[in-house]
């Protein structure tokens, strides 16, 4: 084949080297980008700056070696158009630092940097890290700080991540409620913070205020729907990014469905409950507590981390006639209570007999003395004979 | 124990060059940076530049670089400053310092070279 | 270049007074130097980073900070450490010194 005269020439069936002295001031406009997986500059000192700009388009881009050039700043979201890169060669430029932003994302199997005039502060502690970890190839190359030593020796004591403290309200929180939450951030060189609402969505209306240290964030008019929402503070600094994230109780009255009784491996009388905090259960089968024992038992599938609601089964194991009837399930929490009732046949009767003759069943009456028609609205002082917390 | 020794004063016209020296001893030369930190009298630190011995790479205050040149002798564990293009204001004492990677600091000084500049 | 400020540029105290000199960065750093420099002499390292004791330092001299604001501390001045001290950093390219603080006896 004939020689390229190009500043760029194609290698392989997608591979491009640009490697005529001083050719290329910038990657723009690289002959057939897209497809290109593998990049190789070498001897480009007018090459000083690789910016997002630079790889757009790079989209399959697996090696990218850039070398003996004049790569002074690599922008921290250069990379954030080739997701797919594995192998990153800078060495033998005239790198002084690179950020933690710059490789974040990336599933780096191997970073060479050897070469460059690292200079060694606290911004090179994610590298110092690899090194210590064994991570990209790094610890063979025995990276040495201008002018300092080498990289491993970098004291880190004070290079830590920010710190973040995040102040929610102590007192109970009620649906209409305007809540204040403020996130204090401290540590060294911070750069950037914020909040993180991805979750809220309609659980209130949201006002952000203030800035570095102090973060101030009013969720107005919260709803229920907050309960178990994150809402999360971040903050980078030089070092790397820290963010902790907290949950805005907001009570609201207990509430109970059920549903028709199907039968699966027992049969299984479905509800489910909500409130905040979490109701306390009862159940009762034809106005009477219902003591639940190991053939009759209330069972909560894994409860979702972003809901208070609760779903869950009453389970029957082999229930005949006796167990026909109707029944109540309860909940209750310090802002009100709900009742719902279902009606139940899980077998025929099989004997003949008067309607009007008593079952014998060993339930334990409610209240004797009481006629109301709606337990919920009982002011009794009679204890809850099951109390199963919810949450 | 680890010592560096400077050469002696010096007297300068302007626009002329001056080369001060700075041996080491008691240390494994080639191992550690060696950084040059002049004073003008009466004033503060001021960082010039820096050596490694092992390799000869150089780093330089961008206030210095083209008129500075640092370079090394191993074989006498010697490292030397160069100033061409001397100016009044480049009078000052001249003090080359090692920086110590293990407790990464400047830990030993060299005691100090004056140079004068004066028509 | 990250500038270094000290203050005071000089003061005065007696023997056993305690004295407190403060280095300001231009931008946050990672960790900060003292030296310590008496007439016709070489600078001596004091601290390094942030709050270490050099080698042969005695204990009465502290540092501490972080960011943008630093201090060194001597919580009870001996007649020996009359002289002038110098904050330096090196968390970019070049390494800066503060202007210096002149301790004099009163």
């Known amino acids: 084949a004939a020689p390229c005269p190009d500043a760029c020439c194609p290698h392989g069936s997608s591979g491009l080297r640009c490697t005529r002295d001083g050719a290329l001031d910038s990657l723009h406009h690289l002959p057939g980008a897209e497809n290109l997986t593998e990049l190789y500059i070498e001897n480009q000192q007018h090459l000083q700056h690789l910016e997002l700009r630079d790889l757009r388009g790079l989209g399959e881009l697996r090696n990218l070696t850039i070398v003996k050039s004049g790569l002074r700043f690599v922008a921290p979201d250069a990379f954030h158009f080739t997701p797919r890169l594995s192998r990153l060669n800078l060495s033998f430029n005239a790198l002084e630092s690179l950020s933690w932003k710059t490789v974040q994302g990336l599933s780096l199997q191997e970073l060479v940097l050897s070469g460059n005039p690292l200079h060694c502060s606290c911004a090179l502690r994610w590298l110092q890290r690899w090194e210590e970890e064994g991570l990209g190839g790094v610890p063979e190359q025995k990276l040495q700080c201008h002018g300092q030593g080498p990289l491993a020796h970098m004291p880190n004591a004070s290079c830590g991540v920010p710190t973040l403290k995040v102040q929610v309200p102590n007192a109970s929180v009620d649906v209409g409620d305007d809540v204040l939450l403020r996130c204090q951030v401290e540590g060294r060189g911070l750069e950037q913070a914020g909040w993180i609402l991805t979750e809220l969505e309609q659980s209130a209306t949201v006002m952000k205020s203030g800035g570095l240290p102090s973060l101030g964030l009013t969720l107005a008019n919260v709803t229920s729907d907050l309960n178990r929402k994150n809402v999360t503070c971040w903050a980078e600094n030089d070092v790397g990014r820290a963010e902790v994230s907290v949950q805005v109780n907001v009570s609201f009255p207990a509430s109970v469905q059920l549903h028709t009784a199907v039968e699966m491996h027992h049969w299984c009388i479905p509800f489910s409950v909500d409130g905040q905090p979490a109701p306390s259960l009862r159940w009762l089968f034809n106005g009477s507590v219902l003591n639940e024992t190991s053939f009759i038992f209330t069972e909560f599938l894994e409860p979702a981390a972003n809901e208070t609601v609760r779903h869950g089964c009453l389970r029957l194991n082999q229930p005949t006639h006796v167990n026909n009837g109707n029944y109540t399930l309860l909940a209750a929490n310090p802002f009100g209570q709900a009742s719902a009732s279902i009606m139940a046949a899980f077998m025929d009767n099989p004997f003949e007999f008067n309607p009007e003759d008593p079952i014998p069943v060993s339930f334990s009456p409610v209240d004797t003395n009481s006629t109301s028609g709606d337990p919920v609205e009982k002011k009794d002082e009679t204890p809850f004979g099951v109390s199963v917390a919810v949450g | 124990q680890v010592q560096l020794v400077q050469s002696g004063a010096e007297v300068k016209k302007p626009g002329a060059s001056v080369k001060v020296s700075c041996k080491a001893s008691?240390?494994?030369?080639?191992?550690?940076?060696m950084h040059w930190v002049r004073q003008a009298p009466g004033q503060g630190l001021e960082w010039i530049g820096t050596?490694?011995?092992?390799?000869?790479?150089?780093s330089f205050a961008q206030k210095f670089q083209g008129r500075v040149t640092l370079t090394r002798d191993t074989s006498t564990s010697t490292a030397y400053m160069e100033l061409s293009s001397l100016r009044s204001e480049d009078t000052a004492v001249y003090y080359c310092?090692?920086?110590?990677?293990?407790?990464?600091?400047?830990?030993?000084w060299g005691q100090g070279t004056t140079v004068t500049v004066s028509s | 270049d990250i500038q270094m400020t000290q203050s005071p540029s000089s003061l005065s105290a007696s023997v056993g007074d305690r004295v407190t000199i403060t280095c300001r960065a231009s931008s946050s750093i990672s960790w900060l130097y003292w030296f310590q420099q008496k007439p016709g002499k070489a600078p001596k390292p004091l601290i390094y980073y942030t709050s270490t004791l050099g080698s042969g330092v005695p204990s009465r001299f502290s540092g501490s900070g972080s960011g943008t604001d630093y201090t060194l501390t001597i919580s009870s001045l001996q007649p020996e450490d009359f002289a002038t001290y110098y904050c330096q950093q090196w968390h970019s390219y070049p390494p800066t010194f503060g202007g210096g603080t002149k301790v004099e006896i009163k």
């Open positions: 310092t090692r920086f110590y990677f293990e407790d990464w600091y400047f830990d030993v």
């Open positions: 008691g240390y494994t030369f080639t191992t550690y940076w």
């Open positions: 050596i490694y011995p092992g390799n000869s790479d150089t």
